[in-house]
């Protein structure tokens, strides 16, 4: 019994599963895209690919009222090691530049789906 | 929109140099990896070089090995290529392009030509 409530105990979500889900969040997202996405909404692009998790949240905790990525938001929020607030700025951004939502969506699946192929987890 | 915009080209006599330059705009540059391509007249498209999103590798022709050298400046969302010791035989239209193996991340620029006259 001891053995079975161990396994019926959630637990921590291993990193590998959480980046995969959160792949499978970005490809629901493209794929089921009809009307431009958060109303054709601008975010800070990135120019690093360290730190890119609490970065990409940075550019996307941003858009509001958008429940199509308020799911991607919540799941990037479990990567990123400290609390991000609306109109923060990180030195991971191309000021003054700014990408729709969608595409930057598409390029954070892109990056993901490498991440996921080099065994980068966390 | 997504924008790949390169400069540089021009003539220039066997043996010179030129630096090409490619400004991305419209998207994550920093995730993509990147390469120049180029299409000599009556001519097939040849990758010239390729560099991976954070720069880490690059990868280079056999015609072009140990005279050009590919590098990215992500801050600034600009690829740049840079042609020393040009023969005849590079003259062409060189293209900045992403460099993904899935092509629903594929886009090209317009394209700069590179003369090498004799």
């Known amino acids: 019994l001891t053995c079975l409530g161990g396994f019926a105990s959630p637990g921590p979500v291993p990193p590998s599963t959480a980046l995969r889900e959160l792949i499978e969040e970005l490809v629901n997202i493209t794929q089921n895209q009809k009307a431009p996405l958060c109303n054709g909404s601008m975010v800070w692009s990135i120019n690093l690919t360290a730190g890119m998790y609490c970065a990409a949240l940075e550019s996307l905790i941003n858009v509001s009222g958008c429940s199509a990525i308020e799911k991607t938001q919540r799941m990037l929020s479990g990567f990123c090691p400290h609390k991000v607030s609306a109109g923060q700025f990180s030195s991971l951004h191309v000021r003054d530049t700014k990408i729709e939502v969608a595409q930057f969506v598409k390029d954070l699946l892109l990056h993901l789906k490498k991440l996921f192929r080099e065994g980068q987890f966390n | 929109g997504v924008q790949l915009l390169e400069s540089g080209g021009g003539l220039v006599q066997p043996g010179g140099s030129l630096r090409l330059s490619c400004a991305a705009s419209?998207?994550?540059?920093?995730?993509?990896?990147m390469g120049w391509a180029r299409q000599a007249p009556g001519k097939g498209l040849e990758w010239v070089s390729r560099?991976?999103?954070?720069?880490?590798?690059?990868y280079y022709a056999d015609s072009v090995k140990g005279r050009f050298t590919i590098s990215r400046d992500n801050s600034k969302n600009t690829l740049y290529l840079q042609m020393n010791s040009l023969r005849a035989e590079d003259t062409a239209v060189y293209y900045c392009?992403?460099?993904?193996?899935?092509?629903?991340?594929?886009?090209w620029g317009q394209g700069t030509l590179v003369t090498v006259l004799e």
């Open positions: 392009a992403t460099a993904e193996r899935d092509d629903t991340f594929d886009y």
């Open positions: 419209g998207f994550t540059f920093a995730w993509y990896d």
């Open positions: 560099i991976k999103d954070w720069g880490w590798a690059t």
